[in-house]
C-alpha cells in the first residue's frame, strides 16, 4: 500500500480466482484512543472498533472511503483505491490502446518544435468518475524538471457503438536547450483513477523523435506566363524553431487531381518555393519535415489550382 496523495492510498492487488488478497491496516488520524468505530462509504454498518482497522482487500467491493468516528463525529478518512495485476500484468482498462506506432501505445506525444514544449494525448471510452494527473521529467535516475498542466478533455468522437473521449496535456521542459543533442529521454507518467480503480501509464521519448511541424503557412500560387506551370511559394510555420538557417525544414509538394485514383505528382525541395504543373480541378499541397532528422511530416497545407 502506498499514498497517492493525502488520505488517498493505493493497494496493489495481485488478483486471481481465490486469491487471498492484501491485508491492510488503517490507522485513525486522531490522538483519541477509545470509543473509535469504522465505517465504509455511506454505510452505517460498523466494520470494527479501535484506533486501527485490519481489512483483507480481495476485490473492489473492499475499496472505498473508510471513516473512523467517535460519538457521531468524523475523525479521519482513508480512501482506498485498487491497482490490479492479473497474470503478472498491471491492468490497462481505463485508456484505449491507440496501436500507433505500435501495440500497447496508450499515450501519444508530439512537439511542434525544439523548445521543450510538447503535448500528449490519450483516449478512453469512460465519461464519468475519471481523473488524471500528469508528471514528467527528463531522465529518471537524476530527473530534470518538466512542468505539465492539467489534463483536459480535448475531443469527443463516436466510434461505432461507443463514444470516445480524448484528453490532452501540455508540458514544458524547465531548462530546455533546443540546439543540444538529447542524451536522456523525457519520461511522462499519467496516473488515472476511475471510480476506485488506479492505473498508471508511461511514455519515454526524445523530443527529436516526436517532432511534427505545423503545416507551411501562406501557401500561394503564381501562374507563369504562357505556361501551365505555376510557382508555388510558402513560408515556415510560425511555431517552428528559429533560426531557420539552423533549424531547417524540407518540403514535399504534391499535385493531386480531384479523383483520389489520379496519379499524384510529388516534388521534394529544401526551398520555400517550387514550380509545378497545375492541372484543371487539381489542388496543390505542401508539407514539412525536419531537414536533418526523419521525424513526422506535418499535415498538408493545400490550395486549389483554379
Amino acid at each position: 500500500i502506498w499514498e497517492l496523495k493525502k488520505d488517498v492510498y493505493v493497494v496493489e492487488l495481485d488478483w486471481y480466482p481465490d486469491a487471498p488478497g492484501e491485508m491492510v491496516v488503517l490507522t485513525c488520524d486522531t490522538p483519541e484512543e477509545d470509543g473509535i468505530t469504522w465505517t465504509l462509504d455511506q454505510s452505517s454498518e460498523v466494520l470494527g472498533s479501535g484506533k486501527t482497522l485490519t481489512i483483507q482487500v480481495k476485490e473492489f467491493g473492499d475499496a472505498g472511503q473508510y471513516t473512523c468516528h467517535k460519538g457521531g463525529e468524523v475523525l479521519s478518512h482513508s480512501l482506498l483505491l485498487l491497482h490490479k495485476k492479473e497474470d503478472g500484468i498491471w491492468s490497462t482498462d481505463i485508456l484505449k490502446d491507440q496501436k500507433e506506432p505500435k501495440n500497447k501505445t496508450f499515450l501519444r506525444c508530439e512537439a511542434k518544435n525544439y523548445s521543450g514544449r510538447f503535448t500528449c494525448w490519450w483516449l478512453t471510452t469512460i465519461s464519468t468518475d475519471l481523473t488524471f494527473s500528469v508528471k514528467s521529467s527528463r531522465g529518471s535516475s537524476d530527473p530534470q524538471g518538466v512542468t505539465c498542466g492539467a489534463a483536459t478533455l480535448s475531443a469527443e468522437r463516436v466510434r461505432g457503438d461507443n463514444k470516445e473521449y480524448e484528453y490532452s496535456v501540455e508540458c514544458q521542459e524547465d531548462s530546455a536547450c533546443p540546439a543540444a543533442e538529447e542524451s536522456l529521454p523525457i519520461e511522462v507518467m499519467v496516473d488515472a483513477v476511475h471510480k476506485l480503480k488506479y492505473e498508471n501509464y508511461t511514455s519515454s521519448f526524445f523530443i527529436r523523435d516526436i517532432i511534427k511541424p505545423d503545416p507551411p503557412k501562406n501557401l500561394q500560387l503564381k501562374p507563369l506566363k504562357n505556361s501551365r506551370q505555376v510557382e508555388v511559394s510558402w513560408e515556415y510555420p510560425d511555431t517552428w524553431s528559429t533560426p531557420h538557417s539552423y533549424f531547417s525544414l524540407t518540403f514535399c509538394v504534391q499535385v493531386q487531381g480531384k479523383s483520389k485514383r489520379e496519379k499524384k505528382d510529388r516534388v521534394f525541395t529544401d526551398k520555400t518555393s517550387a514550380t509545378v504543373i497545375c492541372r484543371k480541378n487539381a489542388s496543390i499541397s505542401v508539407r514539412a519535415q525536419d531537414r536533418y532528422y526523419s521525424s513526422s511530416w506535418s499535415e498538408w497545407a493545400s490550395v486549389p489550382c483554379s
Epitope: E59, G61, D161
Partner: nanobody, 123 residues
C-alpha cells in the same frame, strides 16, 4: 446507454439446471465488466458472479461456487449464467449488471441493470 435484457428464467425442480442469458443493446459490452446478482423476497440484492471484459477472469459468491458458471460472447453482446444442481435457496429474481470494476461483489459498483428474470426452484 446500455440496455440489458435477461431471459431464461423459469420453474425447475431441485437438482436441475437452467441457463440465463443477458443481451445488451445500445452499446458494445466489450468495455464492460459483467455481473449477475439475485434478490429473494424480503432480502437485499446479493452478488452471484462476475466476469471480466475479455472473459479471462471470473469471480463467484461462495454460495454458488462449483455450481454456477458465468461466461460471455462479446460478438453476440451476451452474457450467460449456467446454473446447475439448483437448490430451493437459489429461488430469486436474477439481475444482469454492467460496470467498470472487476472483480466486485458490490452492487453499486455496477452502472447498468436489467429488469430481472424470475427463477423458482421447487423441492
Amino acid at each position: 446507454e446500455v440496455q440489458l435484457v435477461e431471459s431464461g428464467g423459469g420453474v425447475v425442480q431441485a437438482g436441475e439446471s437452467l441457463r440465463l442469458s443477458c443481451a445488451a443493446s445500445g452499446r458494445s459490452l466489450n468495455n464492460e465488466e459483467m455481473g449477475w446478482f439475485r434478490q429473494a423476497p424480503g432480502t437485499e440484492r446479493e452478488f452471484v458472479a462476475t466476469i471480466s471484459r475479455r472473459g479471462t477472469g471470473t469471480y463467484y459468491a461462495d454460495s454458488v461456487k462449483g455450481r454456477f458458471t458465468i461466461s460471455r460472447d462479446n460478438a453476440k453482446n451476451t452474457v450467460y449464467l449456467q446454473m446447475s444442481s439448483l437448490k430451493p435457496e437459489d429461488t430469486a429474481v436474477y439481475y444482469c449488471a454492467a460496470g467498470q470494476l472487476f472483480p466486485s461483489s458490490r452492487s453499486r459498483d455496477y452502472d447498468y441493470w436489467g429488469q430481472g428474470t424470475q427463477v423458482t426452484v421447487s423441492s
